[in-house]
């Protein structure tokens, strides 16, 4: 990697990309934007999918964490020949389909959608796009929109989770590179560490969850700390404090020495979870220690 900013969050990332006729001479810039961004999401638990839309939606690459498959997916993305209309809702349908199937497996991984389009959506197409984006949200997704050139920011603010989830690129496609840092910062939700990472068996503790993006939730009241104990039972706790770079959470009482709790965070009241490799373990603490 080039040493630029990276994201260590474990979630499902969907790129929904406009390949309508109006982007014909700018596909390289779109591809390069996605490629740069894809390489910066580096958690082994992060899965990625590439979806393109014009008059119809196509899933170019289904969700995968396999870096070789992602490399092949990027190769296919580079070969896309744009053409057709801007049926953005067809792209969201393809994302919702995958989220639906992933949710059916029981454990629900958080989903982040980054949708890129140029141009304004005609009234009926805007209606369908907003509706399909809402369906993705109902399934637990966080939706970001990147608008390039002649986009309608008001439309995109309704398709995305909020105005703050829209990335306007007013200077044309060549300016896409300039928003990689900000889109990475905003769309990345990651758990980096827990303090303390070792707690006393049988005692109650508070834990500081260090990371990024915890205030990116549509509603910070819906943020939860989640502890997956010994790979089986999951306990959700409401944090005492939610800041962008940390959460203050009550830790569950783990009765026995050697118990492990894997740390997760939900941005939507437990509908789905961001995973991490951060583990809290218990140890024996003698009286007075």
């Amino acid at each position: 990697e080039d040493g630029g900013p990276a994201c260590y969050g474990g979630f499902d990332l969907y790129f929904i990309l406009d390949k309508s006729g109006s982007v014909l001479h700018h596909w390289n810039e779109i591809y390069y934007f996605v490629e740069q961004l894809a390489h910066r999401f580096i958690s082994p638990q992060l899965r990625m999918s590439f979806i393109v839309f014009s008059t119809r939606g196509t899933t170019l690459m289904k969700l995968t964490e396999d870096r070789e498959q992602i490399r092949q997916g990027l190769e296919e993305l580079q070969k896309v020949l744009p053409g057709g209309d801007t049926y953005m809702h067809e792209g969201f349908e393809r994302a919702s389909e995958q989220i639906y199937y992933e949710n059916s497996q029981g454990y629900r991984t958080a989903s982040v959608i980054i949708a890129l389009t140029d141009g304004e959506l005609h009234e009926d197409l805007f209606f369908y796009s907003e509706r399909e984006a809402n369906r993705s949200r109902d399934l637990g997704a966080i939706v970001y929109c990147v608008g390039v050139k002649d986009f309608n920011e008001t439309q995109l603010a309704r398709i995305a989770d909020s105005k703050d989830h829209v990335f306007p690129v007013n200077d044309g496609f060549q300016a896409l590179q300039g928003i990689i840092h900000s889109i990475l910062k905003k769309s990345c939700i990651e758990i980096l560490a827990a303090e303390p990472s070792t707690i006393c068996a049988g005692e109650s503790f508070q834990v500081v969850v260090r990371g990024n993006g915890f205030r990116h939730a549509r509603n910070v009241d819906r943020v939860l700390c989640s502890f997956k104990i010994n790979d089986s039972v999951t306990l959700n706790e409401k944090p005492f404090a939610v800041e962008d770079t940390y959460l203050l959470c009550p830790a569950p009482i783990l009765k026995e020495v050697g118990m492990k709790a894997a740390l997760q965070v939900s941005m939507n009241d437990g509908l789905s979870f961001i995973s991490s490799s951060v583990i809290i373990t218990t140890t024996h603490c003698s009286d007075g220690s």
Partner: antibody, heavy 118, light 109 residues
Framework: QVQLKESGPALVKPTQTLTLTCTFS??????????VSWIRQPPGKALEWLAH???????YYSTSLKTRLTISKDTSKNQVVLTMTNMDPVDTATYYC??????????WGQGTLVTVSS | DIELTQPPSVSVAPGQTARISCSGD??????VHWYQQKPGQAPVLVIY???KRPSGIPERFSGSNSGNTATLTISGTQAEDEADYYC???????????FGGGTKLTVLG
């Protein structure tokens, strides 16, 4: 647990309209992505999808039969109704309703055999 | 509309691996589902979304999807697996569900 049950006439005359009701329990159509499909199977032949309805009352129909089919739902009664006009002996089949999302149908009714004959 | 093509029949010896194919144009960009149907019974979903197994379905059933072919694999095939198998997928462009023509699996012996 999730259950679906088809009901309707076992015998209809040619040119008549068939009305089939699917009564379901154990799930709600208010889940995003969830819906109910109708599928039929003529004796000794393959499955043929007919129609689908979902939470938002979106209705989708088989291309070859769309002029003859109407699907509707009554969420309060947990029922989905299929009507098929201008019945013909070739429409003789077992008609199934099934719960489904995006093309997958994870629970099926037992099916009801409809014979079209004068 | 998309078309899904299956072989009419497949035979396998007990304990061997049975593979049933389902081909269609660019099928790998779609999700394929597989149903088992025994005589006089309603179909049962055995694989959905290419490779996911519903609860209660034995582990010997698995699925894959690449290129223009999706495959249902039954490893260590048992006599009770003898049935008709149908693949299906959702055609987004026409908003309809398409079934393959079905494959009759015969377990020899």
């Amino acid at each position: 647990q999730v259950q679906l049950k088809e009901s309707g006439p076992a015998l209809v005359k040619p040119t008549q309209t068939l009305t089939l009701t699917c009564t379901f329990s154990g799930f709600s159509l208010s889940t995003s992505g969830m819906g109910v499909s109708w599928i039929r199977q003529p004796p000794g032949k393959a499955l043929e999808w007919l129609a689908h309805i979902n939470l938002d009352d979106d209705k989708y129909y088989s291309t070859s039969l769309k002029t003859r089919l109407t699907i509707s739902k009554d969420t309060s009664k947990n029922q989905v109704v299929l009507t098929m006009t201008n019945m013909d002996p070739v429409d003789t089949a077992t008609y199934y309703c099934a719960r489904g999302g995006y093309g997958d149908m994870d629970v099926w009714g037992q099916g009801t055999l409809v014979t079209v004959s004068s | 509309d998309i078309e899904l093509t299956q072989p009419p029949s497949v035979s396998v010896a007990p304990g061997q691996t049975a593979r049933i194919s389902c081909s269609g144009d660019n099928i790998r960009s779609m999700f394929v589902h597989w149903y088992q149907q025994k005589p006089g019974q309603a179909p049962v979903l055995v694989i959905y979304a290419d490779n996911k197994r519903p609860s209660g379905i034995p582990e010997r059933f698995s699925g894959s999807n690449s290129g223009n072919t999706a495959t249902l694999t039954i490893s260590g095939t048992q006599a009770e697996d003898e049935a008709d198998y149908y693949c299906s997928s959702y055609d987004y462009n026409a908003h309809l569900v398409v079934f393959g023509g079905g494959t009759k699996l015969t377990v020899l012996g």
